[in-house]
Amino acid sequence: WELTILHTNDVHSRLEQTSEDSSKCVNASRCMGGVARLFTKVQQIRRAEPNVLLLDAGDQYQGTIWFTVYKGAEVAHFMNALRYDAMALGNHEFDNGVEGLIEPLLKEAKFPILSANIKAKGPLASQISGLYLPYKVLPVGDEVVGIVGYTSKETPFLSNPGTNLVFEDEITALQPEVDKLKTLNVNKIIALGHSGFETDKLIAQKVRGVDVVVGGHSNTFLYTGNPPSKEVPAGKYPFIVTSDDGRKVPVVQAYAFGKYLGYLKIEFDERGNVISSHGNPILLNSSIPEDPSIKADINKWRIKLDNYSTQELGKTIVYLDGSSQSCRFRECNMGNLICDAMINNNLRHADEMFWNHVSMCILNGGGIRSPIDERNNGTITWENLAAVLPFGGTFDLVQLKGSTLKKAFEHSVHRYGQSTGEFLQVGGIHVVYDLSRKPGDRVVKLDVLCTKCRVPSYDPLKMDEIYKVILPNFLANGGDGFQMIKDELLRHDSGDQDINVVSTYISKMKVIYPAVEGRIKFS
């Protein structure tokens, strides 16, 4: 019996087609992805093959103005239109709190939404009961397939799930659900979830009875043969893991942003054992036409977005200096504003010992592309912010050793004075440079804001300590020459859309007046 699994993950509100780098589509003839194009390919496969499942491994939420405006209603609407069979909850599905998941998505989705390792307690338990499930048994042709969901246990640190959801260890939570499905004689089981490729592989190895793992969160690109675009494969598709009980378990992921449609064919014997698996992600490029009816629907929903981008988010009573003459040479108040917004967006009261789990932000000055003039009645709009942060990036959470941070700050000024983009703006950090010293030895003081303290204060950076830092995904990926971050980071979790983080902060503050306050000094 043959099953075709079509899968997406980390779409991050790319409902419209995008450029090859998943930013806003500029030249339509070279654009990719989007739900209209995805639907064309899915329908093509559904017509050609008998047993097809369309699955999403989480993080549909967060990433473009679509999510900012529609807050998840767009996800439910277009996933319903594409007739997804199941979705696993990702960490970003909790970005607007539990209510922001329940109302727009859980109550509106016509497909099951899954996670076996999220347990509700207290008053939420009855409110959310039945709206998401640990697993779902789906009829496919004359057979059935069990889909078991899972979500990153780090979600409380990455999003806003509140205090009434407990995120258990994925493997511990999955095993009893798989055992139950086996008892019910469901002998073809897919683990669908959002914990990253390393955890996906562990699930394949450790959870007895799981036949296939369809993952997300780490934006992993797997491919067999010559890759069709710029993404470099992290391994073959499917990636085969030998389980502890000796089975070969295929593990797949489909990069991110709706650029690819994962396509996996599995052959099962009559006992539900995987006999063979093969496939590849399908690049959704312009050779695949956009479905006209879905495209028309997208255009209808777009109207509200155009209106939104000119509405006032808040006011500034000071000039927001985002000029390259400032932000690439010294502390600039636009950099301070953005870093403050980044930290504010990551406030999660961890426990009695920590006032927050993260206190530091770094931001490449070259990523700040425009100032905002306060003399336009102080009005700040989404459109203004899109000029400041035009790249559609995310502000991510990483864990780095102090020694790596020190290297990053040395890199920040290694060729100071040439108006290059690597000069770092900061939050929760006090840095002093001595430019008279040779490159690689210019950082003379580096103090960081404590987290394990009731009254935050600045302490010298410790080389061997592990620190959490918020930074643009561009830096996490080694951009602007920050190779040491990419090479030495100990953990990387993708965060919220950059403009969304700043716009939410401004809306929350209503009136802003960021200052230059001595975060960066030269001796």
Epitope: L133, V137, T183, N185, V186, N187, E270, R271
Partner: antibody
Framework: EVQLLESGGGLVQPGGSLRLSCAAS????????YSWVRQAPGKGLEWVSA????????YYADSVKGRFTISRDNSKNTLYLQMNSLRAEDTAVYYC??????????WGRGTLVTVSS | QSVLTQPPSASGTPGQRVTISCSGS????????VNWYQQLPGTAPKLLIY???QRLGGVPDRFSGSKSGTSASLAISGLQSEDEADYYC???????????FGGGTKLTVL
């Protein structure tokens, strides 16, 4: 033809034992989980026991726990129910049932067990 | 006394639509798929509906199932005399770690 055929029912005294068998044909026996379900005269259906397919795990209703044992022999395509310490309230038609997709999808014709002195 | 509650009897005239309800709790219907069986007089039960709303091959489309929260129902439209039988709902119960059957509903076609 796909079928399940029970045997081994009959009259037994309270406290006695009986072993029911269920022979499967027309499909791959080892690929499935199985269950025993009973129906007392004029009453509804009551689940008794189940055995999983791949891992051979067993499950029992509270009313028979410790007295009944479910087992299978894949080489003989046969399911068994060993019933000990029988009581009058165990009197029923016992159905052998195949567990399909999260459901009981195939039933035998049943065998009558009467517990009486 | 079954943990899944069904009305003991239901009736309708030929051509009519009848609905049989099955009420349970979070540990059974709330968390698991519901199946419906038909038992004609003197015969073994026969599966009609599985996974809440999936008709078994060969079952007329007059039979349909649905589930909401901790309740499920079986609807029979265009009632026919051969539909006269006992109908049982069933599901797995997570607490009991076993199958549960409803008490059964005797359907009479008047």
């Amino acid at each position: 033809e796909v079928q399940l055929l029970e045997s081994g029912g009959g009259l037994v005294q309270p406290g006695g034992s009986l072993r029911l068998s269920c022979a499967a044909s027309g499909f791959t026996f080892s690929s499935y989980a199985y269950s025993w379900v009973r129906q007392a005269p004029g009453k509804g259906l009551e689940w008794v026991s189940a055995i999983s397919g791949s891992w051979g795990r067993t499950y029992y209703a509270d009313s028979v726990k410790g007295r009944f044992t479910i087992s299978r022999d894949n080489s003989k395509n046969t399911l068994y129910l060993q019933m000990n310490s029988l009581r009058a309230e165990d009197t029923a038609v016992y159905y052998c049932a195949r567990l399909g997709y999260s459901t009981i999808d195939l039933w035998g014709r049943g065998t009558l067990v009467t517990v009486s002195s | 006394q079954s943990v899944l509650t069904q009305p003991p009897s239901a009736s309708g005239t030929p051509g009519q639509r009848v609905t049989i309800s099955c009420s349970g709790s979070l540990s059974n219907i709330g968390r698991n798929d519901v199946n419906w069986y038909q038992q004609l007089p003197g015969t073994a039960p026969k599966l009609l509906i599985y996974l809440n709303n999936q008709r078994l091959g060969g079952v007329p489309d007059r039979f349909s199932g649905s589930k909401s929260g901790t309740s499920a129902s079986l609807a029979i439209s265009g009632l026919q005399s051969e539909d006269e039988a006992d109908y049982y709902c069933a599901t797995w119960d997570d607490s009991l770690k076993g199958w549960l059957f409803g008490g059964g509903t005797k359907l009479t076609v008047l």
